[in-house]
């Protein structure tokens, strides 16, 4: 069968090889399209409801005034010349529908380097069959799940015109010390061959390098964590930066259930005591920081205590706050 | 001995406020919390609040924001909160209670808290 | 928000060990809800007895016990004596805020 691509809404004419170049003539077409239950036979003679979606001109070629998605399928024609001879010809007929320019919406003005950020999404309306939608950086192809870059996408199809939107929404994660100001575009590349092509106007996001953080201090009194029973402890998170972030404490790995506070208290100290502490620092522009943790632990009376903490991973505590 | 004294009752007018006190003796008062309950009549407790009295640190009870307001003067180690725009809902008796991080030992007597026109 | 819940009511005699409980809507209750157990006597005379699931409040005798028992919390008294007949609360925290129970009136005849 020969392939024909004709764009949805156009005209289109089949020519039936071999049938005489006018009547009287002897020939059929026979479709097997979207319109169609198996095979629909047209004759020359024509008339009847299926002029409207397609017709036999005088010289035998099939016209149809404007091809839909429907008419997607097969186009067979049969001819009989003066002689006798018979003659087939066989159309494989798909369409197709170029689309409006694609458009990056919901595009960022800046993104922070070393997290992942929304760049924006990708629309493109209107095209048949569905394409697809990929995206550039600085002119070369972005690869899906590598080196911080996730796409999501999404297709839909209208329910009256059975035309495609697409959407892709690309996640990137700018490298700290990278491109301050990267290009990123998009492009629609058509499902039928031979189609360049289209992209979008490209957009240029700032990146934004956050400063590094200096580290969260946790200071424990008395010093080493160890105390005798009764006694009381004072664990202190110092954060140098401004303005002041929230202090939360935990124990063990499990946050304590007490209000922000860069004091921790520990009266009257007592066996439910003993365990693993640790500051978190929330700050309004990054996410929480994580001090080191500390052990405390209870000495009897005549055991020499250590003369420094513990170090361990991460812990939450139940201490009072102060 | 550890002692949590609160201030008398009170009868209050609808769109009002009122500050109830709770006065700590008997223990450091900035090295324990003081948390805020309340008991409507006939219905069970409800946690308000809670501040730490030597940074001033607060958490609140949700539906508390912007109803109570949790305060403490170190000099006197004395707990207050301030409860504003009263309702007849708003009566109920409030109580103070010191908490050692996790556990909550020693409450005060109670403040009842009448709202009526 | 959660809902904690108590039994409304139990009664038990002199001597006898009794166990109270408190559910909670969203799941187990783990040692990260901290529970507390509140004891409440007549004219809203109200005492701490343990946090932190089993930490014992100072001055609070050794029959008050507090242990999470399945996917509870759980105070029990060992050797309950008459001057325990009261209301008992649990409290149980949840990320940044405290939810009470309902309360188990305990009898001890």
């Known amino acids: 069968a020969q392939n024909i691509t004709a764009r949805i809404g156009e005209p289109l004419v089949l020519k039936c090889k071999g049938a005489p170049k006018k009547p009287p003539q002897r020939l059929e077409w026979k479709l097997n399209t979207g319109r169609t239950e198996a095979w629909k036979v047209l004759s020359p003679q024509g008339g009847g409801p299926w002029d409207s979606v397609a017709r036999v001109l005088p010289n035998g070629s099939l016209f149809l005034p404007a091809v839909g998605i429907q008419d997607e399928g097969i186009f067979r024609c049969q001819a009989m010349n003066r002689n006798g001879k018979e003659t087939k010809s066989n159309y494989r007929v798909r369409v197709y529908q170029i689309p409006g320019k694609p458009e990056i919406v919901d595009s960022a003005s800046e993104l922070t380097a070393g997290v992942p950020n929304k760049v924006g999404t990708c629309v493109s309306e209107g095209s048949y069959p569905a394409g697809t939608l990929s995206w550039h950086l600085d002119g070369k192809p972005l690869v899906p799940n590598e080196k911080g870059v996730s796409v999501k996408e999404q297709t839909r199809r209208h329910p009256e015109t059975g035309l495609f939107t697409l959407q892709s929404e690309l996640m990137v994660t700018p490298a700290r010390g990278g491109d301050p100001r990267p290009t990123f575009s998009c492009s629609f590349s058509p499902g039928l061959p031979r189609h360049r092509a289209l992209r979008t106007a490209p957009i240029q996001p700032r990146v934004w390098e956050p400063v590094p953080l200096e580290e969260v201090q946790l200071v424990v009194e008395p010093e080493g964590g160890a105390v005798a029973p009764g006694g009381t402890v004072t664990l202190t998170c110092e954060v140098p930066a401004q303005p002041s972030p929230q202090i939360h404490w935990m124990k063990d790995g499990v946050p304590l259930p007490l209000p922000p506070s860069p004091v921790l208290i520990l009266p009257e100290i007592g066996p439910q005591d003993q365990g693993t502490y640790s500051c978190v620092a929330t700050h309004s522009s990054h996410g929480p920081q994580e001090s080191r943790a500390v052990s405390i632990s209870i000495i009897e009376p005549g055991e020499e205590g250590p003369t420094a903490g513990s170090v361990g991973g991460s812990g939450l505590g139940t201490l009072a706050l102060a | 001995q550890v002692q949590l004294q609160q201030s008398g009752a009170e009868l209050v007018r609808p769109g009002t406020s009122v500050k109830v006190s709770c006065k700590a003796s008997g223990y450091a008062f900035t090295n324990y919390l003081i948390d805020w309950v309340n008991q409507r009549p006939g219905q069970g407790l409800e946690w308000i609040g809670v501040i730490n009295p030597g940074s001033g640190g607060t958490n609140y009870n949700e539906k508390f924001t912007g109803k109570a307001t949790l305060t403490a003067d170190k000099s006197s180690s004395t707990a207050y909160m301030q409860l504003s725009s009263l309702t007849s809902d708003d009566s109920a008796v409030y109580f103070c209670?010191?908490?050692?991080?996790?556990?909550?030992?020693?409450w005060g007597q109670g403040t009842s808290v009448t709202v009526s026109s | 928000q959660a809902v904690v819940t108590q039994e409304s009511a139990l009664t038990t005699s002199p001597g006898e060990t009794v166990t109270l409980t408190c559910r909670s809507s969203?799941?187990?209750?783990?040692?990260?809800?901290?529970a507390n157990w509140v004891q409440e006597k007549p004219d809203h005379l109200f005492t701490g007895l343990i946090g932190g699931t089993n930490n014992r409040a100072p001055g609070v005798p050794a029959r008050f016990s507090g242990s999470l028992i399945g996917d509870k919390a759980a105070l029990t008294i060992t050797g309950a004596q008459t001057e325990d007949e009261a209301i008992y609360f649990c409290?149980?925290?949840?990320?940044?805020?405290?939810?009470f129970g309902g309360g188990t009136k305990l009898t001890v005849l």
């Open positions: 969203t799941g187990a209750v783990t040692t990260s809800n901290y």
């Open positions: 209670a010191r908490r050692r991080v996790d556990t909550m030992d020693y």
């Open positions: 409290a149980l925290w949840y990320s940044n805020h405290w939810v």
